[in-house]
């Protein structure tokens, strides 16, 4: 019985560890600045790193510019988006800007897209200053199903800060669905 | 066997609880306003509370102004930094301010410092208004190794809001590294 | 013994799953825009959805405009608050605004209210622009006891963005108290 108990304990420890790790998908994706679209209107950002620098992914998939959920659960989602302009980049077309981020969820089964979180600000970036900067942070707790996709839309993508510490989004699973 | 099973269950419950608690380091550190440096350029903030009011720490260490990781894992890191100015504090030299935060990771083994997250905004704090305020929030999910250190750098530290609900940073472990 | 072991494993799996779910209360509450108070001073927001769209709650209670903790623990709390104004809504009484959020904790046993987190910005919303927008995000890790209540106060509630992706707050339990 003692040996049996040890076996139970051992198998349990193994199972607990394994199931814990398997139960916790995550992703932290950083902007790939080699392929940022232009324009000032709302566009979807499709180029993100998932395996260099701070970027990483586990038990989720990154495909076609979207973060795909592989495992049902409740996830904490977050995004940090930085915009910047230096006078050496040339004059802005307008000093009145709308700098926004939208975190959207797309369901493939029922082709539909919904905004989970939005944030941002209207800004007046005057020519009196040589440098302008603004960051947005959003975060929230959402039920995600396997196959659902998370994507990021922003306004004024040409003003995005391309640093990995500046423009990123991510998710981590907190708990199962009951 | 029934007694043995109860013992297995008991020891498991104990082990599960213990390992769960041990596996979840956290910290929430609030600004110690008695020792804020001056300047408008980027400086490291080294004075934080870890054991009064909302401030707390467990299975992590606070030393020499840095939050030290004691346990490998994936952590959610966050910071909230508030800046404020009232006309009674004196006239601002420039109405054009760069209010920024940088959350940095330092590795002792390989002496190097890297910015994990940044946020902020350039602001125009006109003399027409008697009071100005601005807050930054950043957050993200990062792999941290034992011995690595997290620190906070800001611009214009003399404009920091010294309240514990205003200027703080923290971390909590979400999962082990595979 | 083998059957007994299977039973142990089975009961454990059941217990582990059950205890894990029970140990993880959460809430994500979205603004109920049918009942937003007026004024520009600090007011408590009492109307939130808890069971429609992205709004959800489990092992916590929403009552009298407050999120009530049912289970001791360390929780990550967050709020995202969006303010907006379009010229079609009429002229603003003042172009100098203080757009703020305060996340407060109330203890019933010791009748007292304390601010856990604050964020926001003073803004100059000039008549030169037809649309203005600004979002605040705050988040932090706090020890909460059963019976304690979380509520949201904002300035200028009449400027709140009523969308569920814009104005919301939430919490999820990360770990037990030792």
């Amino acid at each position: 019985i003692r040996a049996e108990k040890a076996m139970v304990d051992g198998s349990w420890l193994d199972l607990a560890k394994r199931s814990k790790l398997e139960a916790q998908p995550f992703a932290h994706l950083t902007i790939n600045a080699t392929d940022i679209p232009s324009g000032s209107h709302k566009v979807s950002l499709s180029s993100w790193y998932h395996d260099r620098g701070w970027a990483k992914i586990s038990n989720m998939t990154f495909s076609n510019g979207k973060l795909i959920v592989n495992q049902d659960g409740f996830y904490y989602l977050y995004a940090n988006i930085c915009f910047r302009h230096h006078e050496t980049s040339g004059d802005l077309a307008t000093e009145y800007l709308q700098l926004m981020v939208y975190v959207t969820k797309t369901s493939i089964k029922i082709p539909s897209s919904h905004t989970l979180m939005k944030g941002g600000s209207t800004k007046y970036w005057s020519g009196n200053s040589e440098f302008h900067f603004y960051s947005i942070n959003v975060g929230g707790f959402f039920k995600l199903r396997s196959g659902e996709e998370i994507s990021i839309e922003v306004s004024n993508p040409s003003l995005l800060d391309p640093d990995q510490d500046a423009t990123y989004f991510g998710a981590f699973k907190v708990r199962d669905i009951d | 066997i029934r007694a043995e099973k109860a013992m297995v269950d008991g020891s498991w419950l104990d082990l599960a609880k213990r390992s769960k608690l041990e596996a979840q380091p956290f910290a929430h550190l609030t600004i110690n306003a008695t020792d804020i440096p001056s300047g408008s350029h980027k400086v490291s903030l080294s004075s934080w509370y870890h054991d009064r009011g909302w401030a707390k720490i467990s299975n992590m260490t606070f030393s020499n102004g840095k939050l030290i990781v004691n346990q490998d894992g994936f952590y959610y890191l966050y910071a909230n930094i508030c800046f404020r100015h009232h006309e009674t504090s004196g006239d601002l030299a420039t109405e054009y301010l760069q209010l920024m935060v940088y959350v940095t990771k330092t590795s002792i083994k390989i002496p190097s410092s890297h910015t994990l997250m940044k946020g902020g905004s350039t602001k125009y704090w006109s003399g027409n208004s008697e009071f100005h305020f601005y807050s930054i929030n950043v957050g993200g999910f990062f792999k941290l190794r034992s011995g690595e250190e997290i620190s906070i750098e800001v611009s214009n530290p003399s404009l920091l809001d010294p309240d514990q609900d205003a200027t703080y940073f923290g971390a909590f472990k979400v999962r082990d590294i595979d | 013994i083998r059957a007994e072991k299977a039973m142990v494993d089975g009961s454990w799996l059941d217990l582990a799953k059950r205890s894990k779910l029970e140990a993880q209360p959460f809430a994500h509450l979205t603004i109920n825009a049918t009942d937003i108070p007026s004024g520009s001073h600090k007011v408590s927001l009492s109307s939130w959805y808890h069971d429609r769209g992205w709004a959800k709650i489990s092992n916590m209670t929403f009552s009298n405009g407050k999120l009530i903790v049912n289970q001791d623990g360390f929780y990550y709390l967050y709020a995202n608050i969006c303010f907006r104004h379009h010229e079609t809504s009429g002229d603003l009484a003042t172009e100098y605004l203080q757009l703020m959020v305060y996340v407060t904790k109330t203890s019933i046993k010791i009748p007292s209210s304390h601010t856990l987190m604050k964020g926001g910005s003073t803004k100059y919303w000039s008549g030169n622009s037809e649309f203005h927008f600004y979002s605040i995000n705050v988040g932090g890790f706090f020890k909460l006891r059963s019976g304690e209540e979380i509520s949201i106060e904002v300035s200028n509630p009449s400027l709140l963005d009523p969308d569920q992706d814009a104005t919301y707050f939430g919490a999820f339990k990360v770990r037990d108290i030792d």
Epitope: G127 | S40, G90, L92, T94, Y96, N156, L159 | -
Partner: nanobody, 126 residues
Framework: EVQLVESGGGLVQAGGSLRLSCVAS????????MGWFRQVPGKERDFVAA???????IYADSVKGRFAISRDNAKNTVYLQMNSLKPEDTAVYYC????????????????????WGQGTQVTVSS
């Protein structure tokens, strides 16, 4: 990099006036606090006057009521109007631009300034 060029110095009799000008090379001059300092041979550089981006001013006690600092952001220029000049005002006058500290009161020292001009000589004869 901001280049600062002073002009307007010269020889003047006690009780007379001079107007110093300092032109900045950048249109973003408007986002810098500006100051005037002076130095006599063998001594430290002394604060004279400073002006915020919003044209709030501060003066050294020795020049209060006699000197006036002003700025014209459209012309990227800061001025120092010096009246009732005294022999002890004789010095090389330097223009400076900076944003290293947030408060005007800190600009009575030289460390908040990022950029300095080459200086212009002012001589007051008795």
């Amino acid at each position: 990099e901001v280049q600062l060029v002073e002009s307007g110095g010269g020889l003047v009799q006690a009780g007379g006036s001079l107007r110093l000008s300092c032109v900045a090379s950048k249109r973003t001059f408007a986002s810098y606090a500006m100051g005037w300092f002076r130095q006599v041979p063998g001594k430290e550089r002394d604060f004279v006057a400073a002006i915020t981006t919003g044209s709030i001013t501060i003066y050294a006690d020795s020049v209060k009521g006699r000197f006036a600092i002003s700025r014209d952001n459209a012309k990227n220029t800061v001025y120092l109007q010096m009246n009732s000049l005294k022999p002890e005002d004789t010095a090389v006058y330097y223009c400076a631009a900076g944003n290293r500290e947030p408060y005007l009161r800190q600009y009575t020292a030289s460390n908040p300034y990022d950029y300095w001009g080459q200086g212009t000589q002012v001589t007051v004869s008795s």
